[in-house]
């Protein structure tokens, strides 16, 4: 159950401009590297549905109300996308700077039996989350400009992320 | 100690439903673990079949099983199933039970840490 | 799905050589790889995780390399009880939806 799920855009505008990439800084040891940084004159898609926010080659859904972190994920994969993958620091930027005051889960898990932080597609993180000694399994990003470990019970408001059509 | 072993396997004739079993000891499936089977057909390579998220039983198939395979788990007895039906030949080969760490929700899995030795399915009338 | 590529199928090594196997996925798998030694008749072994992680217990004559697409195992020093097949596996999954691992066709390593 959803209540009140709405985009963070405004006018729900749909770019229709097809973008270059701009290469982005090697820093595959935190945050392995990503699609964005690998083909410098690719085009990408750049549609968006309704109310997501267009960046790169991505589509964003920045909720309004708030779930747990499974909900989040299953919303998420209602849309035909997944929580987002904050894999570079640009991006990083660009969703802390939309997030402002607000924590968004993102799709960062805490694998217990190796004591690693994983993303949802497996690859590794090796930078750094706050509160790990909380023993949390979930990662937000927002407030703290920070990955910030969190309760994957407690509900916070979530960005899911899909390639732009 | 942890372990995996595998049950059930034997000769099938073609059509045939088989039901493996993986008995998992020295860890408990209500922790986060994405339990597998993988298969071997004699003198070839490895070849993953389906997976299972031991706490809630999210699970996983390869493409090709179309659906003639189900993977279950049971969390009071610490078991994995995997019940084969519509067997043919080319379902000859070894079965491995195998497990990988995995992060909350059954997402942030990773490599096959432990393997159980594997029991053998020979399909042929 | 991600496909992968391992190559050679079958390498010969003198005692105290060095083996190089490589794994060429399909597309960026983000250091998502495991490298497994597999002795004839046993279950597999974890080797190497997360592309260049050697597991515990493992020697450290076994080195994993790459990212991207293109990733390589290398045994130095080869003893005659690395004699096995040796395969790699993806589990980099794109989706976020379930394993869509991957093995390469392996590698026999045959110790002179």
């Known amino acids: 159950y959803f209540p009140q799920v709405f985009g963070k855009s405004n006018d729900g505008f749909v770019p229709t401009e097809s973008y270059g990439t701009t290469s982005v800084q090697n820093v595959s040891q935190i945050f392995g590297r990503n699609d964005e940084s690998t083909m410098p004159t690719r085009s990408y898609g750049t549609v968006c549905p309704r109310n997501w926010d267009f960046h790169q080659g991505k589509c964003f859904f920045f909720s309004f109300s708030e779930s747990p972190w499974k909900d989040s994920m299953d919303y998420c994969a209602t849309q035909g996308s997944t929580l987002a993958i904050v894999n570079t620091p640009e991006k990083l930027k660009y969703l802390q700077d939309i997030a402002g005051i607000e924590n968004y889960f993102i799709g960062l898990v805490r694998q217990p039996g190796e004591k690693k932080w994983r993303w949802i597609n497996n690859s590794v993180f090796n930078g750094n989350v706050t509160n790990q000694d909380q023993n949390f399994d979930c990662v937000t990003i927002g407030l703290t400009k920070t990955y910030d470990a969190a309760s994957c019970e407690v509900s916070y408001r979530w960005i899911c992320e899909m390639n732009a059509k | 100690q942890q372990q995996l072993e595998e049950s059930g396997g034997g000769l099938v004739k073609p059509g045939g439903t088989l039901t493996l079993t993986c008995t998992a000891s020295?860890?408990?499936?209500?922790?986060?673990?994405?339990m597998c089977w993988v298969r071997q057909a004699p003198g070839k390579g490895l070849e993953l079949i389906a997976c299972?998220?031991?706490?809630?039983?999210?699970?996983w198939y390869a493409t090709w099983v179309n659906g003639r395979f189900t993977i279950s788990r049971s969390t009071s007895l610490n078991t994995v199933d995997l019940k084969m039906t519509s067997l043919t030949a080319a379902d000859t080969a070894t079965y491995f039970c195998?497990?990988?760490?995995?992060?909350?929700?059954?997402?942030?899995?990773?490599?096959?840490?432990?393997w159980g030795p594997g029991t053998l399915v020979t399909v042929s009338s | 799905d991600i496909v992968m590529t391992q190559t050679p199928a079958s390498v010969e090594a003198g005692v105290g050589g060095t083996v190089t196997i490589k794994c060429q996925a399909s597309?960026?798998?983000?250091?998502?790889l495991a490298w497994y030694q597999q002795k004839a008749g046993q279950r597999p072994k974890l080797l190497i995780y997360?592309?260049?992680t050697l597991a515990s217990g493992v020697p450290s004559r076994f080195k994993g390399s790459g990212s991207g697409t293109e990733y390589t195992l290398t045994i130095s020093g080869v003893q005659p009880d690395d004699a096995a097949t040796y395969y790699c596996?993806?589990?980099?999954?794109?989706?976020?939806?379930?394993?869509?691992?991957?093995f390469g066709g392996g590698t026999e390593v045959v110790v002179k």
């Open positions: 596996q993806n589990y980099y999954d794109s989706t976020g939806s379930g394993y869509g691992a991957a």
């Open positions: 997360d592309a260049s």
């Open positions: 195998a497990r990988s760490y995995a992060g909350y929700g059954g997402y942030g899995y990773a490599y096959f840490n432990l």
């Open positions: 020295g860890f408990s499936f209500s922790s986060s673990y994405y």
């Open positions: 597309e960026d798998i983000y250091s998502s």
């Open positions: 299972i998220y031991s706490s809630s039983g999210r699970t």
